[in-house]
């Protein structure tokens, strides 16, 4: 048997119990709310900071690319890959055919001002894509040179030069004084590479990584 | 932490909270039911009030289905 | 719907479920306590057993802190 309690005490006990239980409920709900708020607000802030980052990234590129053409990568709405508007895209890169005639060094500088390099061709598929946009009666500088004239060809972006993935015209390269490479069309062999003097003005092809925002 | 990761972590927390509370609620509900039956047997319905009130609570839960 | 959007919807559902269940649990807890008191008054402690059992449940809940 429990000793008898006064009704007043019992009422007081019940009141305290109710207070404890509802306090616990309030605390639990507050914790839930905090969780839920964090789950809603943090992603919102995350999205906001992501948007801010994107805008600053875009502003960074806007200096030389006033407009970008973007496509959604995969299913996620978050990931967009962009190329500057007049540029063409292939795989993870953007390409620009410069029709101004400039020396090799000036062409490379011109590309780098746009955040790119003279084109580095890594595969036959890439070359096949590029030549679709070229004129047969023109020559275009590639990002390939041999400044020492010792036949140590090097790509502008430091990609290792792989003899097995080259598309020289037959008999090329053929002159130690011709230290820069172009891509041009020869009726006998179609499109291929040739070595020429670096100071001679030619058209050029710029290549840059796609801009991911 | 990335944005989706955070969401999944909070999902897990809310899910666990839901499970724990559901278990506690069911346990308490069963205790109340048992108590009501015991009370009825012992005092021939002295505690009909409790039984009724318990029944009301049961009705409420029946109508308020937890989300699937 | 994208994967993250789905996660937020699930968050909302679990959140609401958590709140509803918290309220129901607290309501039931208080009902049980009130019933115990009423029972005590009516039968001079015939239902001490119920009271004790309720107390145990209270102890359990006290120790089992809800996840932070």
């Amino acid at each position: 048997m429990v000793p008898e309690e006064e009704p007043q005490d019992r009422e007081k006990g019940l009141w305290w119990f109710q207070l404890k239980v509802w306090s616990m409920a309030v605390v639990s709900i507050l914790l839930l709310s905090v969780c839920f708020t964090v789950s809603s607000v943090v992603p919102h802030n995350f999205m906001y900071s992501k948007t801010v980052k994107r805008l600053s990234k875009l502003r960074e590129y806007q200096q030389y690319h006033p407009s970008l053409t973007c496509v959604m990568e995969g299913k996620d709405i978050e990931d967009w890959s962009c190329c500057p508007t007049p540029w063409t895209s292939f795989q993870s890169s953007c390409y620009f055919i410069s029709t101004g005639m400039q020396s090799w060094t000036k062409s490379q500088k011109n590309c780098s001002v746009m955040g790119a390099d003279l084109v580095v061709i890594n595969t036959r598929e890439e070359q096949d894509f590029i030549i679709q946009n070229l004129k047969r009666n023109s020559s275009y500088f590639l990002g390939l040179s041999d400044p020492g004239g010792r036949r140590h060809w090097q790509w502008v972006d430091q990609t290792p030069y792989n003899e097995n993935v080259t598309f020289w015209h037959s008999g090329e390269p053929n002159n130690l004084d011709e230290r820069c490479a172009i891509i041009n069309f020869r009726s006998s062999e179609e499109w291929g590479w040739n070595d020429i003097h670096c100071h001679v003005p030619q058209k050029s092809i710029c290549k840059m990584k796609k801009i991911y925002i | 932490l990335g944005e989706p990761q955070l969401c999944y972590i909070l999902d897990a927390i809310l899910f666990l909270y839901g499970i724990v509370l559901t278990l506690l609620y069911c346990r308490l509900k069963i205790q109340v039911r048992k108590a009501a039956i015991t009370s009825y047997e012992k005092s021939d319905g002295v505690y009909t009030g409790l039984s009724t009130r318990n029944q009301e609570t049961y009705e409420t839960l029946k109508h308020e289905k937890p989300p699937q | 719907l994208g994967e993250p959007q789905l996660c937020y919807i699930l968050d909302a559902i679990l959140f609401l479920y958590g709140i509803v269940l918290t309220l129901l649990y607290c309501r039931l807890k208080i009902q049980v306590r009130k019933a115990a008191i009423t029972s005590y008054e009516k039968s001079d402690g015939v239902y001490t057993g119920l009271s004790t059992r309720n107390q145990e449940t209270y102890e359990t809940l006290k120790h089992e802190k809800p996840p932070q």
Epitope: Q102, S103, W104, T105, K106, Q108, K109, S145, P147, G148, G149, N174, N175, L176, D177, E178, R179, C180, I196, H197, C198, H199, V200, P201 | - | -
Partner: antibody, heavy 121, light 111 residues
């Protein structure tokens, strides 16, 4: 010893034509790009034409393009400059120079003694 | 075309002193580590003679008192100590792109 001797300079009238020659010796002529550079009466140096070692390319500044033609005869170790539609501003001392490529550019490491062209009515 | 501006147009330097000739290009004549400016000396009645190529490389047979420096658009030819036989005109030249161009020349006199 590297030697280059220019010849063919003369006094001509505006509109006339003239051919300059440069006989090279003391080096493997066919292996080098060659240029013509002129020095005007006010002592300014001005590039006139270039021919590549393989005879595959010829380059000219706009001021002479279409009027001057550079050529070479590797068998005779001789460089030529055919000039037509001559103007008074073509009056200068004409040097032939051997080109040496350095990185992406070139310089002239040997020069001939020069031959004088005067265009005057 | 790239315009090369030499300064001063003429200078007189005492024997044994330092002569400094400057050449400024209208645009960069450097590419990465390559500085494509060259210097020539021309004595009266003679053709130009190569002194320095690639901004700072001394041509073989040229005395070590000649030195060159610079990058991008600003280049300098130094002669120290100046000797009697250094009285001549000095020209800078670039050929990073066509047409290759020359500076207007600097006439050095020995006092």
């Amino acid at each position: 010893e590297v030697q280059m001797v220019e010849s063919g300079g003369d006094l001509v009238k505006p509109g006339d034509s003239l051919k300059l020659s440069c006989a090279a010796s003391g080096f493997t002529f066919r292996s080098y790009g060659m240029s013509w550079v002129r020095q005007t009466p006010d002592k300014r140096l001005e590039w006139v034409a270039t021919i590549s070692s393989g005879d595959s390319y010829t380059y000219y500044p706009d001021s002479v393009k279409g009027r001057f033609t550079i050529s070479r005869d590797n068998a005779k170790n001789t460089l030529y400059l055919q000039m037509s539609s001559l103007k008074s501003e073509d009056t200068a001392l004409y040097y032939c120079a051997r080109q040496i490529y350095y990185d992406y550019a070139y310089y002239f490491d040997f020069w001939g003694q020069g031959t004088t062209l005067t265009v005057s009515s | 075309d790239i315009v090369l501006t030499q300064s001063p147009a003429s200078l007189a330097v005492s024997l044994g002193q330092r002569a400094t000739i400057s050449c400024r290009a209208s645009e960069s004549v450097s590419f990465r580590t390559s500085h494509l400016m060259h210097w020539y000396q021309q004595k009266p009645g003679q053709p130009p003679k190569l002194l320095i190529y690639g901004a700072s490389n001394l041509e073989s047979g040229v005395p070590a008192r000649f030195s060159g420096s610079g990058s991008e658009t600003d280049f300098t030819l130094n002669i120290h100590p100046v000797e009697e036989e250094d009285a001549a005109a000095y020209f800078c030249q670039q050929s990073i792109e066509d047409p290759p161009t020359f500076g207007g020349g600097t006439k050095l006199e020995i006092k």
